[in-house]
């Protein structure tokens, strides 16, 4: 018997992927478990194999279709079950009715690029990936800039409260190496959370002109 807590958490990327994590204190690492998805108004069922990601945590992705296909809507309910093998049979360990558009986590923004860089400022753009057209413009972003001698955790967060896929960073130091990251979140969904941070974009400001401050 497991004495600690267990937790089953899933997020929908708004298109064709439900990512799930099952954690269970005291569970054996070599336990074989699966996630089963059973939608209420679709003809498909889907299963993925939970694979270890840490000492007592397993994860898998339910791939529902091609990356940009719209496989679920706000009225869908998907019953999700964790099934683990015990000897010769499968035993249900967790169950929930999952409302995809209440549990959103988008893919990290991609295609970050420097549009224009000067001594004290830099204009950066990016794209969102595999995001549903249902959101229209109802998205927000957070961005952060890594300055020399600091950590990402120390970087102040900049909030963009609209679907704006660019930013102009100001008050930068000339001839200095920086890194930049951005993440996205839909406004919809009670349990919706931020996407992972994008891959960092490295850039360098231009040196100050000779003879000037």
């Amino acid at each position: 018997a497991v004495n600690g807590t267990s937790r089953f958490t899933c997020f929908y990327n708004s298109r064709a992927n439900i990512s799930c994590v099952w954690s269970q204190d005291g569970a054996l690492q070599d336990t074989s478990c699966q996630v089963h998805a059973w939608p209420d108004r679709r003809r498909w069922n889907q299963t993925c194999e939970l694979l270890p990601v840490s000492q007592a945590s397993w994860a898998c992705n339910l791939i529902l279709g091609t990356p940009d296909s719209q496989k679920l809507t706000a009225v869908d309910i998907v019953t999700l079950r964790v099934m683990c093998r015990e000897g010769v049979r499968w035993r249900m360990m967790a169950i929930q009715d999952f409302k995809p558009f209440e549990n959103l986590r988008l893919m990290a923004p991609i295609s970050l690029q420097v549009v224009h860089v000067e001594t004290h400022r830099c204009n950066i753009s990016w794209k969102i990936s595999q995001a549903s057209h249902y959101f229209e413009r109802h998205l927000e972003f957070e961005a952060r800039t890594l300055s020399p001698g600091h950590t990402w955790e120390e970087a102040p967060l900049m909030t963009l409260k609209q679907k704006q896929e660019w930013i102009c960073l100001e008050t930068l130091t000339p001839d200095t190496q920086y890194e930049f990251q951005v993440r996205v979140k839909p406004l919809q969904g009670e349990f919706t959370t931020w996407s992972p941070w994008s891959q960092p974009l490295a850039f360098r400001t231009k040196p100050a002109a000779l003879g000037k401050d």
Epitope: N3, R7, A94, N103
Partner: nanobody, 125 residues
Amino acid sequence: QVQLQESGGGLVQAGGSLRLSCAASGRTFSNYVMAWFRQAPGKEREFVGAITQTGRGTFYADSVEGRFTISRINDKNTVYLQMNSLKPEDTAVYYCSAPRSGRAGTRNQMDYEYWGQGTQVTVSS
């Protein structure tokens, strides 16, 4: 915050049936997985079964599978435990419980946040 109140317990002969009810108040009932646990004298509290938010999915402890059925009526904020073919070893205090809103139901009592006071079920031989 969710408040839970069980009812329907009592004394029944082996082989008989009983239906327990659990009335919920507070938050939106349909956001919660609901579960039943039981505790016999001198024993640990054990999982009986759980039902998903819409009632589409259920699962049960091996000891009650095929004899007990959990159902719910969200409009009435109530979950039920229908117990058939009762045995003396089913004697226990039965508790209704729920995890936090949006969380999955599991077999593990540590994962449940809200609990009723319990209702006594006694099965005589």
